[in-house]
Amino acid sequence: YDFTNCDFEKIKAAYLSTISKDLITYMSGTKSTEFNNTVSCSNRPHCLTEIQSLTFNPTAGCASLAKEMFAMKTKAALAIWCPGYSETQINATQAMKKARKSKVTTNKCLEQVSQLQGLWRRFNRPLLKQQGSSDYKDDDDKHHHHHH
């Protein structure tokens, strides 16, 4: 899915109002020095691509994130604020139902959620290399794209 035409400000608002708090709850008890972020993103559509992948695609050692509260809220936000996103997720939803039903918090999952927090930070505040323009946010009319 191409996240270019999402309403980034609305997704950011959804993240800050609830999703971020759910991520913090999930990570509670974890030392802030424990995980180094290795996944990065360069602009908002790229960040959402990486966020989707880490949130919904099962990985070795962490198959259950898609059933977490933050994941369900992420899915809802993308479905509402990204045109046509829901249609692309039908197969993914069926695959998710086949995934392990129990929610297990492994160290690998904690590491993955730490990566997610980093990706969301960059989504909220992309740090673009300066090349002439120093703006780093899309305009409120949302259809202006970053140029590199």
Epitope: S40, W120, F123, L127, K137
Partner: antibody
């Protein structure tokens, strides 16, 4: 706990350069942006720029391009600001700060480094 | 650059007063406004982020509101320890910019 410890006060001559350090502890240094802010005596806050310690990416306030250079050393979890061609206008307190967990504010600040430029 | 015009510059207050500080952006900054408190000789402290969200441990008497270009910071009942300078900041566009500050002083 998260801490940002800045280097001590500096008294320097006009035309010279100075490098101020900001040592981070209590969190994964490469996960969060480090910001630099200038405050002249009795004045407001002026954003200088930001660095991503993970990859060295920076963004500068145009007013400080050619004046400030931001770097970070992952091995020592330390961020630096180098100020060049110093004049009396550069006399100020310089703060480093860390972005918060959401990327929308500065949650931890260094204690500030006072720079005095005088002949 | 986006200019953040903060008013008033000074406020004379008594304990228990309700205080309101205004911050106007020269162009829309959506909800990307933060409020900081700074006491003499100290670093700024984060109070409110993304217009109205309380930072950890910040008392409920501090609140923020607004959207677009007009923002308000309120202290519902001023305490002695609230005497400080308060700054708004926009982080919607580079360069990030701050308001000039509002100093709270005792009447």
């Amino acid at each position: 706990q998260v801490q940002l410890q800045q280097s001590g006060a500096e008294l320097v001559r006009p035309g010279t350069s100075v490098k101020v350090s900001c040592k981070a502890s209590g969190y994964a240094f490469t996960n969060y942006l480090i910001e630099w802010v200038k405050q002249r005596p009795g004045q407001g806050l002026e954003w200088i720029g930001v660095i991503d310690p993970g990859n060295g990416d920076t963004n500068y306030n145009e007013n400080f391009k050619g004046k400030a250079t931001l770097t970070a050393d992952k091995s020592s979890s330390t961020a630096y600001i180098e100020l060049s061609r110093l004049t009396s206008e550069d006399s100020a307190v310089y703060f480093c700060a860390r972005e918060d967990n959401t990327g929308t504010a500065f949650d931890y600040w260094g204690q500030g480094t006072t720079l005095t430029v005088s002949s | 650059s986006i200019v953040m015009t903060q008013t008033p510059k000074f406020l004379l207050v008594s304990a228990g007063d309700r205080v309101t500080i205004s911050c106007k952006a020269s162009q829309s900054v959506s909800s990307d406004v933060t409020w900081y408190q700074q006491k003499p000789g100290q670093s700024p402290k984060l109070l409110i982020y993304y217009v109205s969200n309380h930072y950890t441990g910040v008392p409920d008497r501090f609140t923020g509101s607004g959207y677009g270009t007009d923002f308000t910071f309120t202290i519902s009942s001023v305490q002695a320890e609230d005497l400080a300078v308060y700054f708004c900041q926009q982080h919607h566009r580079f360069p990030l910019t701050f308001g000039a500050g509002t100093k709270l002083e005792l009447k």
